[in-house]
């Protein structure tokens, strides 16, 4: 997959979406100036692409939606990267150009005759891409051509902003929702001094500051806060890890804004550096309950508290799915590729990845093997079935009474396809209500997971709460089997009756030495002691001062008994 | 702040062992504490460390032959099966970290020798 | 494995002189490399640590570079109670370690 050459899926229709998703893991570092993409993704990749595939087929079968009016696609893959996305996106705009070129007869050849070729349908809109970064990098090119773009994982706080992302919508919730949720977890288990980690990009940029931000008003104190890329190398994370050690034993918790892929980078350092258990990562929904993050690396994952969208598996999608082989399947051009990655064998007849693998792949070889459902393909297919839905209600409102495209709707007008997807609202994938609030974002609701240890080397994610608009609920008893259980992260211990806070210059305010007050004072706030007035003592508790009761001598009461300085 | 390994004598063969090293003004739930010995005119061999948190660690070579335990002011180390090979003096030594890193702060060593 | 290679395994130099030591990884372990004096009958003593810092109350006769796989120990201005056995330890990892010390090397002083 470098950048001379680019797959395509096609399906043809009266109206094309195009779509953008991460089909190939992104360019590691020495490859990125070619833009050469990594490995072929499953759930990330093929499984969106066959999402996308089968859930127009089922809209396409639909008669109650957009009757006489058949929805094909254009999928591209975004290798979750910047410069690759902004390269397919080009090519999207380019069909769209020399479509409304031809619509008003500006097509001739070299000859000066007018032309017989009839060039690609336009992109009405685009679905994708999943990363947040290169989301914000391909809107800024769509909403220049005003096509509308619905993401179904971009989750930046920063594209709720109209005014730089106007025709960007989502169905899912801006990241300051789960920055909230993260803040109420460290606050739920008294985690006062956490270390804080991110993926540089927007994702991870934009929801650590949330979490900072969050976590001040909070009296939560960052230990210290680090940026990695996911396709960092070795030394990095290693760096970044024996870095995280320096706050040990404080700041055994580490927030981690991240990318999945950041994340399986710390895991796998902390394997080479035999850190597994030191630390207890609180990750957002990059990591969520992937196995692509934890293969491998599970014993450096135990213990770790994620948040994940709340999006139930698609019975639907896998009936589907399962069924899907490589000598039938022609029209996802990427599938044969993935079955040799995914069973590490030859396919005969297919050029490609001839010199990988030495086995030849076995008929019996099924996807059923070891399936996990991607977490996000509810969101997948809800953002596909809001363009089919904001198709639908715009045909309405612009061809009354008539089935199928009519000439209001000849070429789409990009404008009001946007006006009408963001007063669209549906039944979603899972029951849930689909809809978008004046920013193009949707509702949150988060389940928050943990990772365990169920069995003798064997894993699992576990279901232990929940985060709804702002309300979270866990289960201690799950993630802590016993109080004692529960780790700490904090600077400084709380000071013991009659000592006050004395906050080392340059620390944090989570971090102080406990210095007692002086016989004569009394504790007057935690950071202060305060001498008791002439004629007064502390209290026993020290809170305050008592008067000295005034004791009057009188004749008869014995001589009082005093002592020189050197007695003992 | 000192360290101090106890616990050296002659031994057989196969018969178990355990050195302890006390501190004092170290906070063991701050520090990891690390085991290095050196045979009679060898060098230093690291055999393990126990983190703050602890989580021991041990060289490829160890294979179960030395288990690293600590309380609140010791950490022992048990030789399981000791062989004339383990013949040594025993260091305990604090890491500057809770993890790993360098010992800033070592014992005078306890000797260990293994003989039928 | 994170292994040390420590060169000369022995060297000789006469006061006030210079001497140096090399310290190999087996793969890049960064800075953390701490060096370590040993005299007879004694515990090991920490010169430097992360590669180049010098401990506490030791002589600025002593210094450290290197970074990822390759390491020196300088000693310069060479006195008599230099004389000892000089070990560097990596302090990166404890994941497939053989041995996190360096063979050592002695330095006689003449």
């Known amino acids: 997959q470098s950048s001379e050459r680019r797959v395509v899926a096609h399906m043809p229709g009266d109206i094309i979406i195009g779509a953008l998703f991460s089909v190939h893991h992104q360019p590691t570092v020495d490859k990125v100036h070619e833009r050469k993409c990594g490995a072929v993704r499953e759930q990330y990749g093929i499984q969106r692409v066959e999402a996308m595939l089968h859930t127009l087929e089922r809209i396409n079968s639909d008669p109650t939606l957009l009757p006489n009016i058949t929805l094909g696609c254009e999928i591209r893959d975004s290798c979750w990267h910047s410069a690759v996305a902004l390269e397919q996106s080009i090519e999207f705009i380019r069909d769209s150009l020399i479509s409304s070129e031809e619509e008003e007869g500006l097509v001739r050849c070299v000859d000066g005759s007018s032309s017989s070729f009839r060039s690609k349908k336009p992109i009405v809109g685009v679905i994708g891409p999943g990363s947040s970064s290169v989301a914000i990098q391909v809107q800024n090119l769509l909403q220049l051509f005003n096509i509308p773009q619905i993401a179904y994982s971009a989750t930046s706080m920063d594209l709720s902003d109209k005014t730089l992302f106007k025709y960007f919508m989502r169905v899912v919730p801006s990241d300051a929702q789960q920055a909230r949720a993260m803040v109420d977890i460290v606050k739920r288990y008294n985690w006062t001094y956490v270390s804080a980690v991110h993926t540089e990009g927007n994702y991870g940029e934009s929801g650590m500051e949330a979490f900072k931000d969050m976590s001040a008003k909070e009296g939560i104190c960052i230990a210290h806060s680090y940026k990695i890329y996911s396709n960092a190398g070795e030394q990095s994370f290693d760096k970044l890890l024996k870095k995280l050690t320096s706050h040990l034993p404080k700041a055994r918790v580490v927030a981690c804004f991240c990318e999945g892929m950041t994340v399986r980078g710390l895991l796998m350092a902390m394997r080479r550096l035999g850190l597994a258990g030191e630390f207890l990562l609180l990750g957002s929904d990059g990591w969520a309950d992937r196995y692509d993050v934890t293969d491998g690396y599970q014993r450096e994952a135990v213990g770790g508290i994620t948040i994940k969208l709340q999006s139930p598996d698609v019975k639907w999608f896998d009936d589907y799915y399962l069924k899907l082989r490589p000598e039938t399947n022609h029209r996802n051009p990427w599938f044969q590729e993935f079955w040799q990655h995914r069973f590490q064998c030859r396919l005969e007849g297919f050029p490609q990845e001839n010199s990988k693998y030495n086995k030849t792949c076995d008929s019996s070889l099924t996807l059923k093997t070891h399936h996990v459902q991607d977490s996000k393909m509810g969101f997948v297919i809800n953002a596909i079935y809001s363009m089919a839905y904001g198709l639908h209600n715009m045909q309405m409102s612009l061809c009354p009474g008539y089935a199928g495209l009519c000439d209001a709707m000849k070429p789409i007008d990009g404008r009001k396809l946007l006006e009408s997807l963001m007063k669209t609202n549906f039944t979603g994938v899972s029951g849930d209500m689909i809809l978008f609030d004046e920013n193009g974002d949707s509702p949150g609701r988060y389940e928050i997971m943990n990772f365990k240890e169920m069995g003798k080397d064997y894993f699992d994610y576990i279901n232990v709460g929940s985060w709804d608009n702002g309300e979270l609920k866990m289960d201690d008893d799950e993630v802590w089997s016993k109080k004692s259980n529960i780790i700490r992260s904090v600077c400084s211990e709380p000071c013991e009756k009659g000592q006050i806070k004395v906050i080392r210059k340059g620390e944090v305010s989570c971090c102080w030495t406990c210095t007692p007050c002086k016989e004569n004072e009394y504790v007057f706030d935690e950071y202060t002691c305060k001498a008791c007035q002439l004629g007064s003592w502390p209290t026993d508790d020290l809170t305050g001062c008592d008067l000295i009761p005034v004791q009057y001598l009188r004749w008869g009461d014995p001589e009082p008994d005093y002592k020189d300085d050197d007695d003992k | 702040q000192s360290v101090e390994e106890s616990g050296g004598r002659l031994v057989t063969p196969g018969t178990p062992l355990t050195l302890t090293c006390t501190v004092s003004?170290?906070?063991?739930?701050?520090?990891?504490m690390g085991w290095v010995r050196q045979a009679p005119g060898k060098g230093l061999e690291w055999i393990g460390i126990i983190y703050a948190s602890g989580n021991a660690w041990y060289a490829n070579w160890v294979k179960g032959r030395f288990t690293i335990s600590k309380t609140s002011t010791t950490v022992d180390l048990k030789i399981t099966s000791p062989t004339t090979e383990d013949t040594a003096t025993y260091f305990c030594?604090?890491?500057?970290?809770?993890?790993?890193?360098?010992?800033?702060?070592w014992g005078q060593g306890t000797l260990v020798t293994v003989s039928s | 494995a994170y292994d040390m290679t420590q060169t000369p395994s022995s060297v000789s130099a006469a006061v006030g002189g210079t001497v140096t030591i090399k310290c190999q990884a087996s793969?890049?372990?960064?800075?953390?490399l701490s060096w370590y004096q040993q005299k007879p009958g004694q515990p090991p003593k920490l010169l430097i640590y992360?590669?180049?810092t010098l401990a506490s109350g030791v002589s600025s006769r002593f210094s450290g570079s290197g970074s990822g796989t390759e390491f020196t120990l300088t000693i310069s201005d060479l006195e008599c109670a230099d004389a000892a056995t000089y070990y560097c330890q990596q302090g990166y990892s404890v994941a497939n370690v053989d041995n996190a010390f360096g063979g050592g090397t002695e330095v006689v002083v003449k």
């Open positions: 003004g170290i906070d063991l739930s701050s520090n990891a």
């Open positions: 030594a604090r890491d500057a970290t809770a993890t790993w890193d360098y010992f800033n702060l």
């Open positions: 992360r590669a180049s």
């Open positions: 793969q890049s372990i960064s800075n953390w």
